[in-house]
Structure formats: C-alpha cells, structure tokens
C-alpha cells in the first residue's frame, strides 16, 4: 500500500512538473530587461522568451511579437527551444509508460513487468527533468555572465525571468517524481520473483514479508 502511495505521489509530482515545464517553455519571461524613462521610473519592460518577445509599458499595455525567423535566433535559443520540446515529449512518453505499468491498470498483467514499466517511467521522468534543467541553467548562466561582463552596458543587462524559476521548479518536480517512481521499484519488482523464492523456502517466517502477501498455492 505504501508502494502504491509513493507511486501516486511520484506521478502527481511529475504531472505538476510537466505542466510547469509547459508553462515555462511557453511564457516569454526567460529574460527580462527594464528600461528607465525620463522620470527615473521603469518606462518599459521587455520580456524575451523562446518563441516571442513582449514589451510591457508603464500603462500596463503589452504587445508581443512572435520570432519570425528561426535562423535569426542565437544557437543557444534554438537549442533551448529544441530541448524544451524534447523534455515535454519525453515526459509524456514517461507518463504513457507509467500508465501501462501502474498498479491500477490492466495493460500488463505480470507484476514483475508492471514493476519494470514503473521503473522505466521513473527513469524517463528523471531524463525529462535533466533535459528541462539544461536550457534553464544555460540561459541563467548567459544572463549572469552578461550581467558581470564589463563590456555589456548597464542598460543592456537582463535579469532572470519568471520562466526560469518555473523551469527549475519543473525540473525539480520531474526529478523528484521520477526518483520516487524508481524507489517504488524494489518493493514492486520483488513481488514477481518472490513466488519462486517462496517455493524453495522451508518456512514462511524466513521471509520478512507477511504471509498474506503471497498466494497460498505457492507454498510447498
């Protein structure tokens, strides 16, 4: 039962991570630049994302422009786009693998196969978490590098946007959820082979689990 609880918690965390990752990739708040107007107040804020850039005026009016040319984008931005999409697709694949092996589904009947699928989904979610982390950390590194670069003027320096924090959260949730699904595996995985171990046991108490966990027909 504890194993099922951990599985549910793991998959809930990964789902939250996936949603966070989707929002992070879609929102144009990766890099933020504030421009000071005549009266020493922020006149405009420019948000840059993976797909578009937006300008928010002091009046609150916002206008966004989708990047018209992929070729015009820096290679790191193109890579971030690709990794973001791949990470989301990998996580979706992980979810499908999990659903096939979940305790409450009947896609796969054998318990050891189910356990293997849950373990696989956990690993896939961890990979997705790492893939999410790469573009976020890379972009943050570029912003911080420019911030401390004396050749970059003050007005040209950007700040970390909300999308980066969402990306870190997404990555953390995917890694944590995937890790939990991997951790449920030893208990899930040993349920299959335990049938055979029980056949050769001379006495039930030699196995630490309660006898109620095993089908009685397996006892010699």
């Amino acid at each position: 039962m504890a194993s099922a609880g951990m599985q549910i918690l793991g998959v809930v965390l990964t789902l939250l991570g996936w949603v966070n990752g989707l929002v992070s990739c879609a929102l144009p708040m990766w890099k933020v630049t504030a421009f000071i107007g005549n009266s020493i107040v922020v006149a405009q804020v420019v948000w840059e994302g993976l797909w578009m850039s937006c300008v928010v005026q002091s009046t609150g009016q916002m206008q966004c422009k989708v990047y018209d040319s992929l070729l015009a984008l820096p290679q790191d931005l193109q890579a971030a786009r690709a990794l973001c999409v791949i990470a989301l697709l990998v996580a979706l694949f992980g979810l499908l693998v999990y659903l096939a092996g979940a305790k409450c589904t009947t896609c796969v009947e054998e318990k050891d196969s189910k356990a293997r699928l849950v373990l696989t989904s956990g690993i896939v979610f961890v990979i997705s978490g790492v893939l999410t982390l790469i573009p976020v950390c890379w972009t943050a590194h570029a912003i911080i590098r420019d911030f401390y670069n004396p050749l970059v003027a003050e007005a040209q320096k950007r700040e970390l946007g909300a999308s980066l924090y969402l990306g870190w959260a997404a990555s953390g949730l995917l890694l944590l959820g995937g890790g939990l699904l991997c951790c449920t595996c030893p208990s899930g995985g040993s349920q299959g082979p335990s049938h055979y171990m029980a056949r050769y046991s001379t006495s039930a108490p030699a196995i630490s689990r309660g006898p109620s966990e095993y089908p009685t027909k397996n006892y010699v």
Epitope: F35, E48, S53, K65
Partner: antibody, heavy 124, light 107 residues
Framework: QVQLQQSAPELARPGASVRMSCKAS????????MHWVKQRPGQGLEWIGF????????EYNQNLKDKTTLTADKASSTAYMQLTSLTSEDSAVYYC?????????????????WGQGTSVTVSS | DIVMTQSRKFMSTSVGDRVSITCKAS??????VAWYQQKPGQSPKLLLY???TRHTGVPDRFTGSGSGTDYTLTISSVQAEDLALYYC?????????FGAGTKLELK
C-alpha cells in the same frame, strides 16, 4: 570604448562593384547585430539591412536586396558590405551601426554606435 | 513598412528656449522609437530609445515622450551645440524606418 572604423571613400564607375569594411573594437563583435544605413547627399537615412555576426544571418531592405551583400569575419571583428551594379543612385555615405540591444529579434533595433561613414561616388 | 513622419522639416529656436520635435508612426510601434542627432559632416548619434530612455552620456535636457503612434522629443533649454538635424526611427520591426528629419536652427 566601442569604435567602428570604416574603410576609405570609394570612387567607382557605373556598373562596377565596391566592397567596404567596418572594423569593430571595444566590445565582443559576435554578441551584437551590425546594421548598415545609407544617406544620400542632403537626404535622410535609409536602412539597408543587418547581419548577426555569430551566425551570419542577414536581413535586407527589400528595395536594396539585389544590390547589397552583407558578410562578417569573426576572426578580424570586421563587417563587410558589397554593392553591385552601381548607378548614380548609389552615390551616398554608407554607415555601419551597432544594434544597441542584446534583445534577439523584435523591438530592440535602436543603433547606439555608428562608424564615421564610407563615401561612395559613382561617376563615369 | 512602417512610415515615420516628421511633419516639420525646419524649426527655428533661440538659445534657452524649450523646443518639441514631433514624429508620427503609421501604426502602433509600442514606444519602440529612437531619436538621433546628426551634425553636419558627422554620423548620427543616439539620444533616446524606447521613446523616453536616455542613452549613456546624453544630457537630461533631452526628454522623450509618446505612445501608440505619436512621439515627441523635447529639449528643455536649447544650447548652441544642439543645433542639428534630428531623426526619429522606429525600432519595433524590420525594415527599420526613419523620419525625414527636422533641422533645428537659430532664429
């Protein structure tokens, strides 16, 4: 400090080609987009196009696209503009100018540092 | 293409006067307007961008305002060295377009 040093004035015959240079110093050449602007005698400013030195990506003003080729040499931090099939309409001062903003595309096309200009005279 | 219109080709002023140069865009450019100063025989010099943000080293007598399609460059107290050509430019999208210029001259 940021400097854009442009090549010497050019005198060319109609139908000929010229290639002018713009050597950048005082900043990381590949980080900033380089624009080119045309100014005919006693006239206003006309945008020619830009090049992103890191990738070589170019964008041109459609009116001048067939006449102009922009290139950049990362090793020497130099941007080049070639003008072909010259006519008297091409007699002008040509400026290279650095894009102020690091913002990738859209909104950020203000030009903060300009070269001293290269004068091109087309005469037979 | 976005057309930038500077309705006045010339503006006469005296030293110490307050002067405003206007520029109208053919469509909303979301305050993505820059102003340049050009003196005879020199290359243009960036004064303001984002309609109201002063570039490094630009005196605070130069201020900018506007939104949507209408933009203004104001010199609060004209100095002799301010007599020059002033261009507005939209930095909203390519192709970049400039106004025809307004020449500030002494009365």
């Amino acid at each position: 400090q940021v400097q854009l040093q442009q090549s010497a004035p050019e005198l060319a015959r109609p139908g000929a080609s010229v290639r002018m240079s713009c050597k950048a110093s005082g900043y990381t050449f590949t980080t900033y987009t380089m624009h080119w602007v045309k100014q005919r005698p006693g006239q206003g400013l006309e945008w020619i196009g830009f090049i992103i030195p890191s990738s070589g990506y170019t964008e041109y003003n459609q009116n001048l696209k067939d006449k102009t080729t922009l290139t950049a040499d990362k090793a020497s931090s130099t941007a080049y503009m070639q003008l072909t099939s010259l006519t008297s309409e091409d007699s002008a001062v040509y400026y290279c100018a650095r894009q102020f903003s690091l913002i990738t595309t859209g909104f950020g096309y203000a030009l903060d540092y300009w070269g001293q200009g290269t004068s091109v005279t087309v005469s037979s | 293409d976005i057309v930038m219109t500077q309705s006045r080709k010339f503006m006469s002023t005296s030293v110490g006067d307050r002067v405003s140069i206007t520029c109208k865009a053919s469509q909303d450019v979301s305050t993505a307007v820059a102003w340049y100063q050009q003196k005879p025989g020199q290359s243009p010099k960036l004064l303001l961008y984002w309609a109201s943000t002063r570039h490094t080293g630009v005196p605070d007598r130069f201020t900018g305002s506007g939104s949507g399609t209408d933009y203004t460059l104001t010199i609060s107290s004209v100095q002799a060295e301010d007599l020059a050509l002033y261009y507005c430019q939209q930095h909203y999208s390519t192709p970049l377009t400039f106004g025809a210029g307004t020449k500030l001259e002494l009365k």
